[in-house]
């Protein structure tokens, strides 16, 4: 009798030990994971995060679609709606250069760096060549008339525009439009001005920054968060809190991301900080990630979202701050009337697009999203989509703008910058992070389950045997 009872008790004890061990392993395992993650996401020499941060292992592509104007004469002569036809994608490989001037500052636990710019055309991923021609707004004419509203200056500009045979629209190659060309009208300006114009001029051989970000050594919750940009904590483009540099650069976020979080990040392309909210769970190459999207609320007018009041910087074009979906970034572009929006004026008010025909906004194609691995905070896949527009206004003094009867926010191009973790990197990530965590979770569950089952089973058997013996 004793042998059997002792065996049952031993089994119950082993079960209890296994269950306790499994239970203990949960917080301990979590602690181990947190400890490992905290160690590996710090931005310092020797960590996984640092290696991938210095030079992204992911191939990043920037696709461009150009809005080819179909009726330039009609617009110029009759102030008709602008008919556009998007042509693209024209694809470039970007962000392939390693960060430069990386300097650790142990005093405040930050690391500073420059992000060099470079673009390599990818013919196999494009619909044409860099020599393809497009009819687009004359960037110099539109910008000059906005920068110099003084009528006398405009009369002077008009004589130079006429002399150079420039017009409201121009034909330019893709290479010229994106990376720069010498403008014939600006070449005649008698005082010193930059005569080169381009949507992204200058780009190659330039760098974005200096960025100074927290390396996470003192507090992991601050890792990758920007401390200063170009030596300042503010941008000097906006009023109040709109001017703040918030969050990271969106390449990564502090670890242990929760679905309830609002992820703040700064984008120098749009000259502002913005935010993303959780949308859905996504499985990316076997890695569970959280998809965060830029909500329409971020592009709303101050009437719809009072938080955006300080992004409304002028009253006329914005119809007294009631228009939405476009952001005037002229202060950040040396006064050039550049407006940023989502492609095809997605989430924009009808008055913005009523002067343009041929646009088809579509959430799936035109919104921006970030797929973030929640444990590490790494962005494993993203699609950054934005449209660059230029404001052109009627001018009584500039002949080629004289017949316009209204303001136009003219779409020039839209871009889709994408990056997805490669298959090899994903495999490595699965084995090193997801795999290990899943294995640990599995071991915890097995120990706990087996332990509880053993304990319960042996205890029931023991109780049953005892009651038999007593009888």
């Amino acid at each position: 009798g004793c042998d059997r009872n002792c065996g049952l008790i031993t089994g119950a004890v082993i079960g209890a030990v296994l269950a306790v061990f499994g239970g203990i392993l949960m917080p301990v395992g979590d602690m181990l994971i947190q400890k490992t993650i905290k160690k590996e996401v710090v931005l310092e020499e020797g960590t996984i995060a640092f290696k991938n941060w210095v030079k992204t292992g992911t191939e990043i592509y920037r696709q461009f679609w150009i809005f080819d104007v179909q009726n330039p004469q009609e617009v110029m002569m009759n102030s008709s709606n602008i008919q556009v036809k998007q042509r693209g994608p024209y694809t470039y490989r970007v962000r392939f250069l390693a960060k430069e001037n990386i300097t650790q500052d142990p005093k405040d636990n930050t690391v500073s760096f420059l992000q060099p710019n470079g673009a390599i055309f990818e013919p196999s991923l494009s619909v044409g060549t860099e020599a393809d021609n497009f009819t687009v707004l004359n960037l110099a004419v539109a910008a000059a008339s906005h920068i110099y509203p003084n009528p006398f200056v405009q009369v002077v500009l008009n004589s130079l525009i006429n002399k150079s045979k420039s017009s409201m629209f121009q034909v330019r190659t893709l290479r010229e439009l994106l990376w720069g060309y010498t403008d014939p009208f600006l070449s005649l300006v008698p005082y010193p001005v930059s005569t080169r114009v381009g949507m992204f001029y200058p780009y190659n051989n330039t760098a974005d920054g200096v960025y100074k970000v927290f390396n996470g050594k003192d507090s992991i919750s601050k890792v990758a968060i920007i401390d200063t940009y170009k030596g300042k904590r503010n941008l000097s483009y906006w009023e109040s809190y709109c001017d703040m540099i918030n969050g990271t650069d969106a390449a990564s976020f502090p670890p242990f991301v929760e679905k309830s979080q609002v992820l703040q990040f700064f984008s120098s392309d749009i000259c502002r900080s913005i935010y993303a909210v959780f949308e859905s769970d996504v499985n990316l190459k076997g890695i569970p990630v959280y998809r965060f999207v830029l909500p329409s609320k971020a592009f709303a007018s101050p009437v719809q979202n009072p938080d955006n009041h300080c992004f409304c910087t002028e009253k006329i074009i914005s119809k007294n701050c009631t228009s939405y979906g476009v952001l005037d970034i002229s202060k950040c572009k040396e006064g050039k009337p550049v407006y940023i929006s989502l492609p095809h004026f997605l989430y924009a008010s009808p008055d913005v697009s009523e002067t343009i025909d041929g646009l088809n906004p579509n959430e799936e194609e035109h919104r921006t999203y970030l797929d973030i691995e929640p444990i590490t905070g790494f962005t494993l896949q993203f699609a950054k989509r934005l449209q660059v527009n230029l404001l052109v206004k009627p001018s009584n003094k500039i002949q080629v703008l004289k017949r316009l009867k209204r303001n136009y926010i003219v779409p020039i191009l839209w871009l889709n910058e994408t990056g997805t973790i490669g298959d090899e990197k994903a495999k490595m990530f699965r084995s090193q992070v997801t795999g290990k965590i899943n294995l640990l979770g599995l071991i915890e569950m097995i120990l706990l389950s087996v332990g509880v089952v053993m304990f319960v089973a042996f205890m029931i058997s023991y109780c049953a045997c005892r009651s038999k013996t007593i009888k």
Epitope: N150, P151, F152, V153, V156, N158, Y191
Partner: antibody, heavy 122, light 107 residues
């Protein structure tokens, strides 16, 4: 009150140069163009040129391109016109005129100096 | 260069009469015409600016019309204080050009 105060009359010899000043007050000098206009005795008005003080940009009537040079000193809110290689047909009243305005429509030459008489004589 | 032909060179009217001065330009200048009054011994004074806009403080008896190349300046009910030279100025293109002037006298 907007005022444009020009320097006094000048009597100069042929071939010489002269520099006329126009001191402004009552408005933001850099924001509005300053023009210079010539009026020969008993004749019509001729536009010499204009300068935009904000960036120093100038435009000249081709006829006066080699005759007049327009400059500004924004620290003293003063515009200047230098005339060189003077001849007898340069004898005239020279006016500075500002585009400072309020209200509708863009008005040219809204405020004028009192004029500076330049006499070229041997 | 846009040339401006102003007529008549001079005219003499009785007080209370209507005065009409005409300026014709050699190129189309839309409505970029301005009109000035110059009293003896004084600098010119802007009466009407581009777009036939009467300047603040200018009496409503002064008016103008025209578009393109043909412009007319009118004084209704002429007063003795209107004795002056009148000039038109085109401000459409460089160089700005004035008309030759019209001398108004009272009979």
């Amino acid at each position: 009150e907007v005022q444009l105060q020009q320097s006094g009359p000048e009597l100069v010899k042929p071939g010489a140069s002269v520099k006329i000043s126009c001191k402004t007050s009552g408005y933001t000098f850099t924001e509005y163009t300053m023009h210079w206009v010539k009026q020969s005795h008993g004749k019509s008005l001729e536009w010499i040129g204009g300068i935009y003080p904000y960036n120093g940009g100038t435009a000249y009537n081709q006829k006066f391109k080699n005759k007049a040079t327009l400059t500004v000193d924004i620290s003293s809110n003063t515009a200047y016109m230098a005339l060189r290689s003077l001849a007898s047909d340069d004898s005239a009243v020279y006016y500075c005129a500002s585009d400072y305005f309020y209200g509708d429509g863009y008005p040219w030459f809204t405020y004028w100096g009192q004029g500076t008489l330049v006499t070229v004589s041997a | 260069e846009t040339t401006v032909t102003q007529s008549p060179a001079s005219l003499s009217v009785a007080t209370g009469e209507k005065v009409t001065i005409r300026c014709i330009t050699s190129t189309d200048i839309d409505d970029d015409m301005n009109w000035y009054q110059q009293r003896p011994g004084e600098p010119p004074n802007l009466l009407i600016s581009e777009g036939n806009t009467l300047r603040p403080g200018v009496p409503s008896r002064f008016s103008s019309s025209g578009y393109g190349t043909d412009f007319v300046f009118t004084i209704e009910n002429t007063l003795s204080e209107d004795v002056a030279d009148y000039y038109c100025l085109q401000s459409d293109n460089l160089p700005f050009t004035f008309g030759s002037g019209t001398r108004l006298e009272i009979k």
